[in-house]
């Protein structure tokens, strides 16, 4: 921000009324009036260029310092070219000297040179040559000097002429302030510029109404430079929840809008399924039946639990069931739907029922499923199973009601045995099998059916209570189709896959290959 100038003395604006002191009296400096741009202007002028040893002083009136620490002196003046005088005026000069003196009181007409300290020699950038003078072109020079730190109540300036032809048209003395400033929602007070050029005065800012320093942020500070400019902003204020930045202020969110945190962001429109918010809202309440999960951003619409899975099927495959379902028709407005599968088994004879989570096996963990199918195995034959698939989302935990669909299935067969070839020879095949332990108690025998591949007219059957059998009297180097099936009191269980096993050829009869 531009520095603010506080003027302590302005000769040009005073219209010749200041009455400065000249020394020696009646010689040297003289108050003149001239016409420029059809306006009367006043100037202090001296032009004793033909006489040597000039020492003419012009002293200002006493200037009250006030709060100024460093003053700036702006001079507007014109200096005539020494060559514009006949014979060159050998004693003529083209500079003058600027002095100051501090004091706690006004000495009036008591002028003492020794009290004055030289600030600088003032030289023009442009001198007024003869042609400019004749044409009344005033070559105005502007020079600025500064003095500080000042400590007394007031001061004088003085101008010493040593034989120049000079006119002072303007003497302006001012000090600089960093103006009151609103930046980053912080208000910085008007501050007097310091007196030492390298130093910057640190000034703390105050957050505007309804603005705060963000958590973990720095307090707002700026630095007031010697020239009255604000520099190096540090920290900031942000509008508090329920308020947004409008130009340099924090304004309450309009009805129907909200802002839930201290941030730079504007107020947002209340999302779907929320009630209209009042002015200055930090959040928007959910409509009846709609909810917001703890992790949901406030900008997200309110949502509700999903409806039940749309369609559920249970397809039995021996002692396995594949459960398939479709997503709920109403997701509740959320995408974080998961499914939970629970299982209940009932004994047909007694009608007694109980949970079966511990006795069955799921193809993947049954809670928090994201896919819409799961396979349940290790089911006991001749048992009734009821499967419940519940759809849940991020807000399901906020209500007591559940959204689920059930499917029941009766297991009438054992699971198909898993068959392995344990060994073979040119005339025999050793075969073993297994079924899940929960089903073994219901099996009283296993039936092994085998035949030559390609011979669909005849087959052989062997029954055993064990889990293995050796099939003898087989033809060498021949492929046999083998299937194992469990037999229960209620009938046949599910048959295994049909396996192809080949006997050895006569050349390799010495070894038993597995």
């Amino acid at each position: 921000a531009q520095g603010k100038e506080v003027v302590l003395l302005d000769f040009a604006a005073a219209g010749g009324e200041l009455g400065w002191l000249t020394h020696p009296y009646g010689k040297g400096w003289d108050l003149m009036q001239n016409i420029m741009n059809d306006m009367p202007i006043y100037m202090y002028s001296v032009c004793n260029v033909m006489s040597g040893d000039q020492d003419n002083w012009l002293r200002t009136n006493w200037v009250y310092r006030g709060e100024a620490e460093r003053i700036f002196i702006e001079l507007k003046f014109t200096v005539r070219d020494c060559n514009s005088f006949p014979g060159g005026a050998s004693s003529c000069k083209e500079t003058f000297n600027l002095y100051y003196a501090e004091s706690d009181l006004d000495y009036g007409t008591n002028f003492q040179k020794r009290l004055f300290t030289k600030i600088d020699t003032i030289a023009p950038d442009e001198i007024t040559v003869s042609s400019d003078f004749e044409a009344r072109h005033v070559k105005l020079n502007v020079e600025e000097r500064s003095v500080g730190p000042l400590t007394r109540k007031g001061f004088y300036l003085a101008f010493q002429d040593i034989g120049a032809c000079v006119a002072l048209l303007s003497v302006r003395v001012y000090y600089k302030k960093c103006p009151e400033l609103l930046q980053s929602l912080a208000r910085f007070p008007e501050t007097i510029a310091g007196s030492d050029a390298p130093s910057l005065a640190t000034v703390a800012g105050t957050c505007v109404d309804h603005a705060v320093v963000p958590p973990g942020g720095e307090e707002p500070r700026m630095h007031c430079a010697v020239d009255g400019e604000w520099l190096v902003p540090i920290g900031q204020c942000l509008c508090q929840a329920g308020y947004e930045k409008v130009e340099d202020a924090c304004q309450a969110c309009s009805p129907g809008f909200f802002k839930f945190e201290v941030s730079e962001s504007p107020c947002l429109e209340c999302p779907e399924h929320t009630l209209p918010s009042p002015e200055g809202a930090t959040s928007c309440e959910c409509e009846e039946g709609f909810f917001r999960a703890p992790q949901d951003p406030m900008s997200m619409p309110c949502t509700r639990p999903p409806s039940a899975p749309h369609y559920l099927t249970a397809v039995g495959m021996g002692a396995k069931v594949e459960l398939r379902w479709t997503p709920p028709q109403d997701s509740g407005g959320r995408e974080d739907i998961v499914y939970s599968v629970t299982c209940e088994q009932c004994w047909p004879e007694s009608g007694e029922c109980g949970p079966c989570e511990s006795s069955v096996r799921y193809s993947e963990p049954p809670h928090g499923l994201t896919r819409t199918s799961v396979t349940v195995s290790d089911l006991e034959p001749h048992m009734n199973y009821t499967f419940t698939v519940e759809a849940r989302n991020g807000v399901s935990g906020l209500v007591t009601s559940r959204s689920f669909r059930t499917a029941s299935v009766s297991i009438n067969q054992t699971e198909p045995p898993k068959v392995r070839l344990e060994g073979r020879s040119t005339t025999s095949l050793s075969v073993s099998w297994s079924i899940p332990p929960p089903q073994q108690s219901r099996v009283w025998k296993y039936e092994v059916t085998y035949r030559k591949k390609g011979d669909s007219n005849s087959y052989n059957v062997r029954r055993t209570e064990g889990f293995s059998v050796t099939l003898d009297d087989l033809a060498p180097d021949t492929t046999y189709l083998v299937q194992v099936q469990a037999l229960t009191q209620e009938g046949q269980g599910a048959g295994s896959k049909v396996h192809e096993f080949q006997t050895l050829s006569p050349e390799g009869s010495g070894s038993l290959a597995v």
Partner: antibody, heavy 128, light 107 residues
């Protein structure tokens, strides 16, 4: 020594014309502002016109504006006053006068000029 | 235009007298005032410029003072050569008007 010598005066009828000349010597003519000042018989001085060192700007008294023309020829060190539509009240001794800013010991020139050097004058009589 | 009024219009004085002539401007002219001396049948001669500055070659018995609207020319110790008519002239405006003159005669 600065010398200004006017010529061209004489008797002329009302409505007639006359051209006055002023020959300058003893100084750098092209540095000087030049002017014509007249004095009616037994009366005071009246400024008539001025011309800048290099031929401009020119100014005229209201009483002669539009009738008189001031000019100069710096190569000939001569100042002129062309007087047309002459009237009886133009009867006067016409002085040529000069001003050199070098001799004006002020930092800022006055709004107009005063006259440091004068010629001896030439009489113009307008009469029928 | 600015009017310049001189007083008195004439005065009688003796050699050695101190004589003062005044000139009043109809509006402020700061110090932009010149004084001239004219003898019968001769051209005027510059005495003083900028109200108080003595022109080169002018005797120091002549002095000028004043600013704004009131000005004076003083001859301190009148000499026989000083009997003449004196004119003031303002050069604060382009019209450059003269006073009507003050005739200084021998008593």
């Amino acid at each position: 020594e600065v010398q200004l010598l006017e010529s061209g005066g004489g008797l002329v009828q009302p409505g007639g014309s006359l051209r006055l000349s002023c020959a300058a010597s003893g100084f750098t003519f092209s540095h000087y502002m030049m002017a014509w000042v007249r004095q009616a018989p037994g009366k005071g001085l009246e400024w008539v016109s001025r011309i800048g060192p290099s031929g401009g700007p020119t100014h005229y008294a209201d009483s002669v504006k539009g009738r008189f023309t001031i000019s100069r020829d710096n190569s000939k060190n001569t100042l002129y006053l062309q007087m047309n539509s002459l009237r009886a009240e133009d009867t006067a001794v016409y002085y040529c006068a000069g001003y050199d800013s070098g001799y004006d010991y002020v930092a800022v020139a006055g709004p107009a000029e005063y006259f440091q050097h004068w010629g001896q004058g030439t009489l113009v009589t307008v009469s029928s | 235009d600015i009017q310049m009024t001189q007083s008195p219009s004439s005065l009688s004085a003796s050699v050695g007298d101190r004589v003062t002539i005044t000139c009043r401007a109809s509006q402020s002219i700061s110090t932009w005032l010149a004084w001239y001396q004219q003898k019968p049948g001769k051209a005027p001669k510059l005495l003083i410029y900028k109200a108080s500055n003595l022109h080169t070659g002018v005797p120091s018995r002549f002095s000028g003072s004043g600013s704004g609207t009131e000005f004076s020319l003083t001859i301190s110790g009148l000499q026989p050569d000083d009997f003449a008519t004196y004119y003031c002239q303002q050069y604060n405006q382009y019209s450059r008007t003269f006073g009507q003159g003050t005739k200084v005669e021998i008593k």
